[in-house]
């Protein structure tokens, strides 16, 4: 056989109506956005509007108080992390609208999603720090009277940001722009290619340090705090309980889909049907997690209204009342003057 019997393949199903609108070839299936992507866009839009305005207001209120009020330091850092994350949303929104096409270049692909991840980790780690602060206020009030100062709070925040930066490095290093040949599309994502073990390691570290560990910290801290509060018959124990339940529940609700899909995808073959299904849900999971970036200002306002009975004050003064009230350190009243201090934990960011 000198040459293979090359017969023209059967393209009977292919007619002129099927011809690509041939100047800009596009996959037929990609003309309309998938339902998960549409939902993600709606969430992104709402989160952006509420998150930018709300967190900007929180930053404005807390910035002036951060020198003298420790709670203001916590809220300021959380709001900055959330605010920065929200600023990246228009880019993510644009990419999804364009069927995940990334027209922003290689540098933006490396930096921008990594920056978002940095802020996500920073928020989670700051929450763990705040939880530790709540714990110490209840169980080590004397120590707090002696050592709990603004300087230490800023150091704790710096450590949280530094650790967040370290956790973000793998994402930065492995993030690449890939230009697909057909349909013509530039994609931004991580590519571990030959190193599946490293991909899994990164996913496991992300799950443990970005989800399980903060969750454990919060649960343990608040279990002890609640037990102490109940034993002292604190007047606001019911309200505190509700806040704690909200904190833990929201942590689960908003982060579980993101983390579960992330860990599953790292253990699946990229061409497997399950992987492809999870990939279609990826944007929705990210947008769901992003709700954390806008929820805090809402909680502060709701909490503020709760304490005031009804919204009599202006929004800035209401927030100032909620966010800058310093904790009272007394053994007999080891909880804080304001339940909103505990409510601050709600800021579960990405």
């Amino acid at each position: 056989m000198d040459s293979f019997n090359y017969t023209t393949p059967d393209y009977g199903h292919y007619d002129d109506k099927d011809t690509l609108d041939l100047n800009t070839p596009v996959d037929k299936t990609s003309n309309t956005l998938r339902v998960p992507d549409i939902l993600a866009l709606v969430i992104f839009a709402v989160v952006f509007l509420v998150g930018v305005l709300g967190n900007a207001l929180v930053v404005w209120v807390t910035a002036f108080e951060a020198k003298r009020t420790i709670n203001a330091i916590w809220f300021l850092n959380l709001a900055v992390a959330d605010f920065l994350s929200c600023l990246a949303l228009p880019i993510l929104f644009t990419s999804i609208v364009q069927h995940h096409h990334w027209p922003f270049g290689g540098a933006a692909c490396s930096i921008l999603p990594s920056l978002i991840l940095l802020n996500m980790y920073a928020s989670i780690l700051l929450l763990a720090t705040i939880s530790a602060d709540r714990f110490l206020l209840v169980f080590k009030p004397i120590w707090c009277q002696n050592f709990r100062g603004a300087g230490l709070a800023w150091i704790a925040c710096a450590v949280a940001w530094g650790l967040a930066l370290l956790l973000t490095i793998p994402s930065f290093l492995y993030r690449v722009v890939r230009e697909e040949y057909f349909p013509p599309k530039v994609l931004c994502g991580v590519d571990y290619s030959h190193d599946k073990r490293r991909e899994r390691a990164v996913a496991i570290v992300r799950l443990v340090l970005g989800f399980l560990w903060p969750l454990l910290t919060l649960t343990i801290c608040y279990t002890f705090i609640l037990l102490r509060t109940w034993s002292r018959r604190a007047t606001r124990s019911t309200k505190t309980l509700k806040v704690v339940v909200a904190v833990v529940a929201s942590f689960f609700i908003f982060w579980l889909p993101y983390q579960v899909t992330g860990i599953m995808m790292s253990f699946l073959e990229p061409s497997s049907p399950t992987f492809l299904l999870l990939k279609k849900l990826d944007s929705l999971c990210v947008s769901f997690a992003y709700i954390n970036c806008c929820i805090n200002p809402i909680i502060y306002v709701v909490a503020g209204q709760g304490f005031q009975g009804r919204l009599r004050k202006s929004l800035p003064s209401l927030l100032r009342n909620v966010l800058t009230e310093e904790s009272v350190v007394r053994e007999s009243k080891s909880f804080t003057r304001s339940t909103v201090d505990t409510m601050a934990q709600k800021t579960q960011a990405v």
Epitope: Y14, D16, L22, E180, P270
Partner: antibody, heavy 125, light 112 residues
């Protein structure tokens, strides 16, 4: 019978330009993209780019962006590639190859199902 | 660019032998649609290349079933179960997942 008939061997001087042709028959010209591939002895195959004959949409390998100009004449079902500012490195065999635009799960213009016989270009002073 | 690394560069075989050619890509070739666009071509002496296998493991029409392709992600293999005289030539792997499309350096199959 699908055929991609390429023009004969070319001899050109450095700095000159040359236009290679690929005349097709046996299929609907506008329903297939036409790609161009370069082959130098011992250096394997290099993708130059493609033209979509239906709308004259072209896509190049960045390496050949300023070197190759791809065009198509629908009336004669012929694809052309003009190579400009020739250097000795441009001496090679150039192939045209078509890709089927079939739809379906994962189908599309992904592989070269038919190739021309090749045109040998020699750049010499 | 995606670098396609083929091994071995030369493969001397006897008629009826099994032959195996490996191709490794520097990046994952999994397309966003889940498909892998890795193909194999054979260029016989003095001829233009001809398509053997498309999308990792699909034989092109008219290609004998002694040719088979396999692999995933970044590692791919072309196997010839019983080598015949007309199988002599240079085998190229090629990817069309990412731009620019790239080819392996080729594996020369020759008879001992």
């Amino acid at each position: 019978q699908v055929q991609l008939q390429q023009s004969g061997a070319e001899l050109a001087k450095p700095g000159a330009s040359v236009k290679l042709s690929c005349k097709t028959s046996g299929y609907t010209f506008t329903n297939y993209w036409m790609h161009w591939i370069k082959q130098r002895p011992g250096l394997g195959l290099e993708w130059i780019g493609y033209i979509n004959p239906s709308g004259d949409y072209t896509k190049h390998n960045q390496k050949f962006k300023d070197k190759a100009t791809l065009t198509a004449d629908r009336s004669s079902s012929t694809a052309y590639m003009q190579l400009s500012s020739l250097t000795y490195e441009d001496s090679a065999v150039y192939y045209c190859a078509r890709v089927p635009l079939s739809y379906g799960s994962g189908n599309g213009p992904y592989y070269f199902d038919y190739w021309g016989q090749g045109t040998t270009l020699t750049v010499s002073s | 660019d995606v670098v396609m690394t083929q091994t071995p560069l030369s493969l001397p075989v006897s008629l009826g032998d099994h032959a195996s050619i490996s191709c490794r890509s520097s990046q994952s070739l999994v397309h966003s649609n889940g498909n892998i666009y890795l193909h194999w071509y054979l260029q016989r002496p003095g001829q233009s290349p001809k398509l053997l296998i498309h999308k990792v493991s699909n034989r092109f029409s008219g290609v004998p079933d002694r040719f088979s392709g396999s692999g995933s992600g970044t590692d791919f293999t072309l196997k010839i179960s019983r080598v015949e005289a007309e199988d002599v030539g240079i085998y190229f792997c090629s990817q069309s997942t990412l731009v620019p499309l790239t080819f392996g350096s080729g594996t020369k199959l020759e008879l001992k």
